[in-house]
């Protein structure tokens, strides 16, 4: 099985024990590590951070010790914006320039492939996204002709039904991608006005349309029905939780909220907590399991957080094995307890290790 793990370059800027550099990553933990994110400037793939080149080198030296490890560079992301991607993909010349710039950039910096993180193509971009993928793959095939190992091509796709319908021609893009990471998280957010788990495995008992689509099982099944081969589908598992501030004394699933949860001490983003911050939060919190959805949530005071733990990730891995998927994807290594100093077990990367162990189990 594949274990595809994202690393985010901005995690270096977190304070103190939250600061993560690629040299802290376990070289034997994942089969693929994807560095997020690269930029596109003047239609050419480019660095984003001032020290990306240093960090690329740091990441890719892990392969000196584990030659089986593959590294990819992810281009795009939330801050890049859909519009900029749209302009490049929809213009033949811009698209060609971008595609041509990719292989030398990846080779120069020691990457084994490219991950496309266009979040997200609009309805009018659907065909252009397909063309971008098809032409990128053709360029990778051509570039590898002189006996080089062919560069890998993957894409991170939304797990939301509405986005899937408007953004992707699943059957066509699947032909050209080496694997597809389906982002089976962020199903539920503060915009809903109530508590809810952002990455449930199954539909909740109370879920009616459109909530019945907001779970991992539905998203995976839908992708498969649309023509994604199970052998290319990698299922996303988050090492972060989504938090809410409760608006009343109700604390269950569906309780009213006044907004996102308070920012974490290290990630400093309202409504999001890294797993290592959740481990801190759990001291003195009340933990519940949403039985049907097979995921936990915890409450403390007026704070509510839905997250994944070692038990829930094992259930998710068993599910992806039952569906004969290609493996699991983790967002993100730097949100796991990468130092092993928060979650009371001392183990570094406890969630990702639990996923790895479950994938290896017979």
């Amino acid at each position: 099985y594949k274990l595809v793990c994202y690393y985010t370059s901005w995690s270096q800027y977190r304070e103190g024990d939250g600061s993560c550099f690629p040299d802290a990553l376990d070289r034997f933990l994942c089969t693929h590590i994807i560095y997020s994110f690269a930029n596109i400037s003047n239609d050419h793939i480019d660095t984003w951070e001032w020290n990306d080149v240093t960090l690329y080198g740091m990441l890719n030296t892990l392969k000196n010790r584990n030659p089986n490890l593959k590294t990819l560079l992810s281009v795009g992301g939330w801050n890049f914006g859909s519009q900029r991607f749209s302009k490049i993909a929809s213009n033949t010349q811009s698209r060609r320039t971008f595609i041509k710039s990719v292989p030398p950039f990846l080779r120069t910096h020691g990457f084994d492939g490219l991950d496309l993180a266009w979040l997200y193509p609009g309805r009018r971009d659907k065909q252009h996204f397909t063309t971008l993928i098809k032409e990128m793959k053709a360029e990778f095939i051509k570039e590898a002709q002189p006996g080089k190992k062919q560069l890998l091509l993957s894409a991170a796709l939304s797990a939301g039904k509405v986005t899937i319908d408007s953004s992707y021609d699943i059957a066509k893009i699947s032909q050209h991608l080496d694997f597809i990471s389906i982002m089976t998280y962020d199903f539920h957010g503060a915009w809903r006005g109530t508590t809810g788990h952002h990455s449930p495995l199954f539909r909740g008992q109370e879920d009616a349309s459109p909530d019945r689509f907001s779970n991992t099982d539905y998203a995976v099944g839908y992708m498969l029905r649309l023509g994604a081969p199970a052998s290319k589908l990698v299922m996303g598992i988050p090492t972060f939780g989504r938090s809410f501030t409760l608006a009343s004394s109700e604390t269950g699933v569906g309780a009213p909220i006044s907004g996102p949860g308070i920012p974490g001490r290290f990630t400093k983003e309202a409504g999001t907590l890294a797993y290592y911050e959740i481990c801190d939060f759990l001291r003195g919190a009340t933990v519940h399991r949403i039985l049907g959805q097979q995921v936990p949530y915890a409450t403390k005071g007026n704070q509510w957080v839905g997250y994944d733990d070692q038990e829930s990730v094992k259930s998710k891995v068993q599910y992806l094995k039952d569906r004969q998927l290609a493996g699991a994807m983790v967002w993100a290594l730097d949100l796991d307890d990468f130092q092993g100093s928060f979650c009371g077990q001392d183990l570094r990367f406890p969630l990702t290790n639990a996923i790895k162990d479950a994938l290896a189990a017979t």
Partner: antibody, heavy 118, light 106 residues
Framework: DVQLQESGPDLVKPSQSLSLTCTVT?????????WHWIRQFPGNKLEWMGY???????NYNPSLKSRISFTRDTSKNQFFLRLNSVTPEDTATYYC???????????WGQGTLVTVSA | QIVLTQSPAIMSASPGEKVTMTCSAS?????MHWYQQKSGTSPKRWIY???KLASGVPARFSGSGSGTSYSLTISSMEAEDAATYYC?????????FGSGTKLEIK
């Protein structure tokens, strides 16, 4: 090749602070890797004390966290250990070291013996 | 923290003899590193990632193991191999060392 050299007093009184310097040659401490302190007690037991990353971030052994701190002087390519409130149990040979992979120690200084005694 | 127990604490071997020492971890670790230390000198990285020999280490040395059980083997003991050998892990925080196996020449 990278070389590390520890220096500092060889005798410290109980309750005082122990301060050691590691001078690095052959590699800049701001260019990469983590720069560690490890000590070896008279019975030969080895204990990792912590590191200062090339970025300046520190990570300490939880058992020492309340009384240890690392700093550095990048202009002199040196990093420093300060251990407060020492007792005779802190008597040890103190080594500075550099990692290769995250998790093992590829380069070591020759060590400096520090005795804590009145 | 993970405790690494090395056995035997002291052993002796004749030149040409095969030597095996073990390192047992209190919880599963991903891989193990080994160091050689001779009297009055600092430890030297000897074997890393369970089985890879550090630069300059003779091919008669090998390492193996997984989970909680690891070992270092010398296929044919030589006088220069007399030293103390320490195992070390950092799968869990903090990194820890074994108490050492002192290998003497007969």
């Amino acid at each position: 090749d990278v070389q590390l050299q520890e220096s500092g007093p060889d005798l410290v009184k109980p309750s005082q602070s122990l301060s050691l310097t590691c001078t690095v040659t052959g590699y800049s401490i701001t260019s990469g890797y983590s720069w560690h302190w490890i000590r070896q007690f008279p019975g030969n037991k080895l204990e990792w004390m912590g590191y200062i990353h090339y970025s300046g971030r520190t990570n300490y052994n939880p058992s020492l966290k309340s009384r240890i701190s690392f700093t550095r002087d990048t202009s002199k390519n040196q990093f420093f250990l300060r251990l407060n409130s020492v007792t005779p149990e802190d008597t040890a040979t103190y080594y500075c070291a550099r990692n290769y992979g995250y998790d093992e120690f590829a380069y070591w200084g020759q060590g400096t013996l520090v005795t804590v005694s009145a | 923290q993970i405790v690494l127990t090395q056995s035997p604490a002291i052993m002796s071997a004749s030149p040409g003899e095969k030597v095996t020492m073990t390192c047992s971890a209190s919880s599963s670790v991903s891989y193990m590193h080994w160091y050689q230390q001779k009297s009055g000198t600092s430890p030297k990285r000897w074997i890393y990632d369970t089985s890879k020999l550090a630069s300059g280490v003779p091919a008669r040395f090998s390492g193996s193991g997984s989970g909680t059980s690891y070992s270092l083997t010398i296929s044919s003991m030589e006088a220069e191999d007399a030293a103390t050998y320490y195992c070390q892990q950092w799968s869990s925080n903090p990194p820890t060392f074994g108490s050492g196996t002192k290998l003497e020449i007969k």
